[in-house]
Amino acid sequence: MMTGTIETTGNISAEKGGSIILQCHLSSTTAQVTQVNWEQQDQLLAICNADLGWHISPSFKDRVAPGPGLGLTLQSLTVNDTGEYFCIYHTYPDGTYTGRIFLEVLESSVAEHGARFQIP
């Protein structure tokens, strides 16, 4: 029986151009985590295999950094990064647990002010 639960950061927001850490935590189970897959809708961002290390999808290699831990750091955020992200925990013997994070990327207020008060 699958007894575990995934805790996530839930709904988060970040500024355009900044970075954000996506983090999930599996609790209430003694199952062994063999791998965590990070996905965005239909796209694979990264895989963290407990034994083999990290696979970063080439489409994201310039903007994704492994860690901290089993988490994932998204860098150089754009408004297009807004959306759902999933952490998929592959465990033994329980099977698969999935957590959801919603990220909203906001226009930077600093950038707006900078544009408004440019030095001639």
Epitope: Q43, A50, D51, G53, W54, H55, I56, P58, H90
Partner: antibody, heavy 119, light 107 residues
Framework: QVQLVQSGAEVKKPGASVKVSCKAS????????IHWVRQAPGQGLEWIGG????????SYNQKFKGRATLTVDKSISTAYMELSRLRSDDTAVYYC????????????WGQGTTVTVSS | DIQMTQSPSSLSASVGDRVTITCKAS??????VAWYQQKPGKAPKLLIY???FRYTGVPSRFSGSGSGADFTLTISSLQPEDFATYYC?????????FGQGTKVEIK
């Protein structure tokens, strides 16, 4: 240049063990893992498992767990695959291969080691 | 374990032909698929990684596509050196698994 040079062919009796080596040169282990794949005569490719020299972690195909042991001696940049309790259906070419940098595809392969199990 | 099923298992083609090999995964593997070429008595060589990225030095006539469970390797204009066996591989989860292979023979 990148090279993975494997040890020579082996002939073993059923029940025995074999240890195949894979000497790596031309790259560092950082961000990579070393894998072992076998190919029985006229058959396809079968993943045995992989070893992460950075963490010391190993991942095995359950089919080989308990019979295969993967190790790396970083001081001499050599990976090893030991397979015990050999059976005739373990007769195959055994390949070592390295994963790409922070990717899980296999971009360089050794030349292969033929292991024949026969009484 | 995730099964990777290739089709056809073999095909005969002529130099200059367009060749398409398909690989179907038993479950969604996103884009975690690589393609390899193997010639008799030799080790496999990486052609395509992450479903659609051509590996360094691989001729542009080789292309990969697909996502989810259905993947395709295309050789746009078959050359004499392309006659070989081709394998797909998934690394979405362990154990990593390969297709059974597709042998491309001269017609």
């Amino acid at each position: 240049q990148v090279q993975l040079v494997q040890s020579g062919a082996e002939v073993k009796k059923p029940g025995a063990s074999v240890k195949v080596s894979c000497k790596a040169s031309g790259f560092t282990f950082t961000g990579r893992s070393i894998h072992w794949v076998r190919q029985a005569p006229g058959q396809g490719l079968e993943w045995i498992g992989g070893f992460n020299p950075n963490s010391g972690g190993s991942s095995y195909n359950q089919k080989f767990k308990g019979r295969a042991t993967l190790t790396v001696d970083k001081s001499i940049s050599t990976a090893y695959m030991e397979l015990s309790r050999l059976r005739s259906d373990d007769t195959a070419v055994y390949y070592c291969a390295r994963s790409s940098y922070y990717r899980f595809d296999l971009d360089y392969w050794g030349q292969g080691t033929t292991v024949t199990v026969s009484s | 374990d995730i099964q990777m099923t290739q089709s056809p298992s073999s095909l005969s083609a002529s130099v200059g032909d367009r060749v398409t090999i398909t690989c179907k995964a038993s479950q969604d593997v996103k884009t975690a698929v690589a393609w390899y070429q193997q010639k008799p008595g030799k080790a496999p060589k990486l052609l395509i990684y992450s479903a659609s990225f051509r590996y360094t030095g691989v001729p542009s006539r080789f292309s990969g596509s697909g996502s989810g469970a259905d993947f395709t390797l295309t050789i746009s204009s078959l050359q004499p050196e392309d006659f070989a066996t081709y394998y797909c591989q998934q690394h979405y989860t362990t154990p990593w698994t390969f297709g059974q292979g597709t042998k491309v023979e001269i017609k």
